[in-house]
């Protein structure tokens, strides 16, 4: 078991055409974060590097915005954006921490935000 924990926005839902913020927070460790990767399934969406700043993958540049903080904003959502998203914290000396968020993009206006939960 690692020393830190990642808190995420958990299971969330949003309306088609709208936007959503994906957020993770690493706590309970003194390790230094050198980079956070945001991934959807096996696709890299974005990187926030402590030295180099943000890099958004070219194929997502039009619909992904950096922040707030180490989070990621997804815009112009489509039903195809439904699925798992991962924040991957690269730290030293702890190694890698991974948080999971499940996003459901809904056709109607019944989208609700889920509760926050922790992944050790």
């Amino acid at each position: 078991m690692m020393t830190g924990t990642i808190e995420t926005t958990g299971n969330i839902s949003a309306e088609k055409g709208g936007s959503i913020i994906l957020q993770c927070h690493l706590s309970s460790t003194t390790a230094q974060v050198t980079q956070v990767n945001w991934e959807q399934q096996d696709q890299l969406l974005a990187i926030c590097n402590a030295d180099l700043g943000w890099h958004i993958s070219p194929s997502f540049k039009d619909r992904v915005a950096p922040g707030p903080g180490l989070g990621l904003t997804l815009q112009s959502l489509t039903v195809n954006d439904t699925g798992e998203y991962f924040c991957i914290y690269h730290t030293y000396p702890d190694g890698t921490y991974t948080g999971r968020i499940f996003l459901e993009v809904l056709e109607s206006s019944v989208a609700e935000h889920g509760a926050r939960f922790q992944i050790p």
Partner: antibody, heavy 122, light 107 residues
Framework: QLQLQESGPGLVKPAETLSLTCTVS??????????WTWIRQPPGKCLEWIGT???????FHNPSLKSRVTIPVDTSKNQFSLKLSSVTAADTAVYYC??????????????WGQGTLVTVSS | DIQMTQSPSSLSASVGDRVTITCRAS??????LNWYQQKPGKAPKLLIY???SLQSGVPSRFSGSGSGTDFTLTISSLQPEDFATYYC?????????FGCGTKVEIK
């Protein structure tokens, strides 16, 4: 198979700067999942962690070496370096470069260079 | 800094013997303890990581145990190629620190 190779002068004069380079082959230094490290071992003595660097330049170093250490990275050459300033005879040691991995919690040093002896003497 | 203390500093053993080396940390390091083998003129080689996980390619006669502050490296049946110096290392926090080694010699 990943390989690390240290290179640099074997003799350095007191008060000068020790400069070593570690060339990584068989893998990319820009891997997001690994950090890169310098460790030294004075003759007949214990291993000492000098410092660790990430591909982007984030550096962690041993406070015992104060501000004498810098660890530059050159991703275009797949290399990282060690610069240790104001050396004394106490810095005479075999210097190793190593990779921090594998992808586990609080990872160990899983690949090492063969080491290079640096003697500080006038 | 976390101090790592190994014992004994040296030991003599015969081929086929069961050998046990201990490592103690000055504070709890959970299971973030690694073991290395070093032969003269060579770089250290990773044997065990995370206290008890065997590194790929390392013979199963090597095993590790412990958590918190007390750890053990065991060689179940010493082989001729096992005569070397063994080091423990904590990867719990920086500065990373090593024990000063246990030299295993031929009796």
């Amino acid at each position: 198979q990943l390989q690390l190779q240290e290179s640099g002068p074997g003799l350095v004069k007191p008060a000068e700067t020790l400069s070593l380079t570690c060339t990584v082959s068989g893998g990319s230094i820009s891997s997001y999942d690994h950090y890169w490290t310098w460790i030294r071992q004075p003759p007949g003595k214990c291993l000492e962690w000098i410092g660790t660097v990430y591909y982007s330049g984030s550096t962690f170093h041993n406070p015992s070496l104060k501000s004498r250490v810098t660890i530059p990275v050159d991703t275009s050459k797949n290399q990282f370096s060690l610069k240790l300033s104001s050396v004394t005879a106490a810095d005479t040691a075999v210097y190793y470069c190593a990779r921090v991995g594998p992808d586990v919690s609080h990872p160990p040093f899983d690949y090492w260079g063969q080491g290079t002896l640096v003697t500080v003497s006038s | 800094d976390i101090q790592m203390t190994q014992s004994p500093s040296s030991l003599s053993a015969s081929v086929g013997d069961r050998v046990t080396i201990t490592c103690r940390a000055s504070q709890s390091i959970s299971s973030y303890l690694n073991w290395y083998q070093q032969k003269p003129g060579k770089a250290p080689k990773l044997l065990i990581y995370a206290a008890s996980s065997l590194q790929s390619g390392v013979p199963s006669r090597f095993s590790g145990s412990g958590s918190g502050t007390d750890f053990t490296l065991t060689i179940s049946s010493l082989q001729p190629e096992d005569f070397a110096t063994y080091y423990c290392q904590q990867s719990y926090s920086t500065p990373i620190t090593f024990g000063c080694g246990t030299k295993v010699e031929i009796k």
